[in-house]
């Protein structure tokens, strides 16, 4: 049975031209997390594996970055980045994982964090 | 020891589709790309696209996207690209590659398979 | 996409001298995080498939012999066999993999004076 729970960042905001970072924490298992998929709409954007690292795909190579921990980092944000994010956790033996961030990439100056929530 | 073995030598009619298999062993299919790369007689070496088994992420030449597929069976460690509309400069010789992109070790096709020869003929 | 050329098309050299074959990128192949260049080579035999000599531009494959030497950075690299044998007769490629989609040099066929 799946106990787990992914814990993400929520709905987020920030500046065009900026960066943000992406983070999902796995709880309420023991479950061995074998490996991390970062996808933006059905798109990859890399993958973290237990056992080779990261891979960041080489479309989005010079805007992402991996880290802090298994998060990940956008940077120089455009409009166009506007959308769902999903962390994709493989774990054993429990099966896969999935958290959604929504990130908002505004034009003005003001942009603020929203409040965490869980995705069970 | 990795291997990657592909399936047979077929010839096909303009127009119509084939669909060659790569059965990998000898490591975790789930975390290496299975590439696809042809080479015309006498030519050189043309990349077709890739998948990702652990995801089933697909990424495919532009000059290909509409006639290629890639897939992946995760249960028999096999992957497969289906080509269609077939025409004669089509004919080639079609290889499996194993593809390691990661960050940190970055061997990119490491290991290939033993080619399936693809002629297209009237 | 990114270009690779190659040069140059055929290379005739005699026994235990030096082959260099040098290839240039369109675009650089260098990438900035963790500052290695995607480019690797490949040596292919008549009739067989290409196998991987050297990656991230000078890191030779596991059983690859110290004679095959790769260098460069940014958008020209070079392949270099410090002393050439018989078995090394073949056509070599370079390839790129820091953006899709990833292209193959020419190639560059290695022969006996």
């Known amino acids: 049975m799946m106990t787990g729970t992914i814990e993400t960042t929520g709905n987020i905001s920030a500046e065009k031209g900026g960066s943000i970072i992406l983070q999902c924490h796995l709880s309420s298992t023991t479950a061995q997390v074998t490996q991390v998929n970062w996808e933006q709409q059905d798109q990859l954007l890399a993958i973290c594996n237990a056992d080779l690292g990261w891979h960041i795909s080489p479309s989005f190579k010079d805007r992402v970055a991996p880290g802090p921990g298994l998060g990940l980092t956008l940077q120089s944000l455009t409009v166009n980045d506007t959308g769902e994010y999903f962390c994709i956790y493989h774990t054993y033996p429990d099966g896969t994982y999935t958290g959604r961030i929504f990130l908002e990439v505004l034009e003005s100056s003001v942009a603020e964090h929203g409040a965490r929530f869980q995705i069970p | 020891e990795v291997q990657l073995v592909q399936s047979g030598a077929e010839v096909k009619k303009p127009g119509s589709s084939v669909k060659v298999s790569c059965k990998a062993s000898?490591?975790?299919?789930?975390?290496?790309?299975i590439g696809w790369v042809r080479q015309a007689p006498g030519q050189g070496l043309e990349w077709i696209g890739d998948i990702y088994p652990g995801g089933a992420y697909t990424n495919y030449n532009e000059k290909f996207k509409d006639r290629v597929t890639i897939t992946a069976d995760k249960s028999t460690s096999t992957a497969y690209m289906e080509f269609s509309s077939l025409r004669s400069e089509d004919t080639a010789v079609y290889y499996c590659t194993r593809g390691d992109y990661y960050d940190s070790s970055g061997r990119a096709m490491d290991y290939w398979g033993q080619g399936t020869l693809v002629t297209v003929s009237s | 996409d990114i270009v690779m050329t190659q040069s140059p098309d055929s290379l005739a050299v005699s026994l235990g001298e030096r082959a260099t074959i040098n290839c240039k990128s369109s675009?650089?192949?260098?990438?900035?995080?963790?500052?290695?260049?995607?480019l690797a080579w490949y040596q292919q035999k008549p009739g067989q498939p290409p196998k991987l000599l050297i990656y991230w531009t000078s890191t030779r494959e596991s059983g690859v012999p110290d004679r095959f030497s790769g260098s460069g950075s940014g958008t020209d690299f070079t392949l270099t066999i410090s002393s050439l044998q018989a078995e090394d007769v073949a056509v070599y490629y370079c390839?790129?993999?820091?953006?899709?989609?990833?292209?193959f040099g020419g190639g560059t066929k290695v022969e006996i004076k």
């Open positions: 390839q790129q993999y820091y953006s899709y989609p990833y292209t």
């Open positions: 675009q650089s192949l260098l990438y900035s995080r963790n500052q290695m260049n995607y």
């Open positions: 000898g490591y975790t299919f789930s975390n290496y790309w």
